[in-house]
């Protein structure tokens, strides 16, 4: 599941990793755009082994994965994109 959240909270990520995570290990991805209390874009990945990690948005592998997921969600519906505004 790919999620895009717009929140007024401060930054969530206190550290970021560039280490590649294979798609088969990923359960959910959340994208927090910059602004609204956090000056940078944040990407949070939940893994199937019940761990959670912030991924460096500049990491090439996550950029490629995001592009694949975006294309897939715009053509079909297996990976829905949720947009939620939180006041």
């Amino acid at each position: 599941v790919l999620e895009v959240y717009y929140t007024s909270l401060r930054c969530r990520c206190v550290q970021e990793s560039s280490v590649f995570i294979p798609r088969r290990f990923i359960d959910r991805i959340q994208i927090l755009p910059r602004g609204n209390g956090c000056p940078r874009k944040e990407i949070i990945v939940w893994k199937k082994n019940k761990s959670i990690v912030c991924v460096d948005p500049q990491a090439e592998w996550i950029q490629r994965m995001m592009e694949v997921l975006r294309k897939r969600s715009s053509s079909t519906l297996p990976v829905p994109v949720f947009k939620r505004k939180i006041p």
Epitope: R12, C13, V14, Q15, S17, R28, E42, I44, W46, N49, K50, S51, I52, C54
Partner: antibody, heavy 122, light 107 residues
């Protein structure tokens, strides 16, 4: 306000099964990312993680005790359970129920119960 | 399993002292380490998360550092309310493992 409370026998005999209940409030085990676990602490000693159960019924156990542990949950009644079979005196400890939530920043065991003291004695 | 070697097991210090407790991880855990404080007769509570970040409501005299596989908790100026047990926890991988704990007493 998040609270957790453990209950179970104060004393039991070697070879018996220890059954513990955690009753919690202020959160639910149904939302994505929520988990409850058990940690124990023998008197005057360190902490030992025992098991976790997650919203989707995924379970994780300490390998050193995996054959004796069973963790389960009753989501609708806000309860989690731990069973330890074939106890002996080394299982005497204070048992804590703990909450974990997979959010960022991730702080596992962010809330603890008051603990229940269990003594195994013949 | 990842072993967490915590030292000292106990120590006594005077009010106003600078106190440091350390944990060493047997494998790479990155910053996936938490320090807990446990006051006598009470349950532990998170003090520092991701090795260096202060949890909500924790006084600024507490700080955490990481140097490779060595992690330290420092109290810059000891106060009486800091008398407690301190535990480190690695959550890099299951099974999550704690250090043996440090009992901090008043000299």
């Amino acid at each position: 306000q998040v609270t957790l409370k453990e209950s179970g026998p104060e004393i039991l005999q070697p070879s018996q099964t220890l059954s513990l209940t955690c009753t919690f409030s202020g959160f639910s085990l149904s939302p994505y990312g929520m988990g409850v676990g058990w940690i124990r602490q023998p008197s005057g000693k360190g902490l030992e993680w025992l098991a976790n159960i997650w919203w989707d019924d995924d379970k994780y156990y300490n390998p050193s005790l995996i054959n004796r542990l069973t963790i389960s949950k009753d989501t609708s009644n806000n309860q989690a359970f731990l069973k330890i079979t074939n106890v002996d005196t080394t299982d005497s400890a204070t048992y804590y129920c703990v909450r974990s939530e997979l959010v960022m920043p991730y702080v596992p065991f962010d809330y603890w119960g008051q603990g229940v003291m269990v003594t195994v004695s013949s | 399993d990842i072993q967490m070697t915590q030292s000292p097991s106990s120590m006594s210090a005077s009010l106003g002292d600078r106190v440091t407790i350390t944990c060493q991880a047997s494998q790479d855990i990155g910053n996936d380490l938490i320090w807990f404080q446990q006051k006598p007769g009470k349950s532990p509570r998170p003090l520092i998360y991701y090795a260096t970040n202060l949890a909500n409501g924790v006084p600024s005299r507490f700080s955490g550092r990481r140097s490779e596989s060595n992690y330290s908790l420092t109290i810059s100026s000891l106060e009486s309310e800091d008398m407690a047990d301190y535990h480190c926890l690695q959550f890099k991988q299951y099974p999550y493992t704690f250090g043996a704990g440090t009992k901090l007493e008043l000299k």
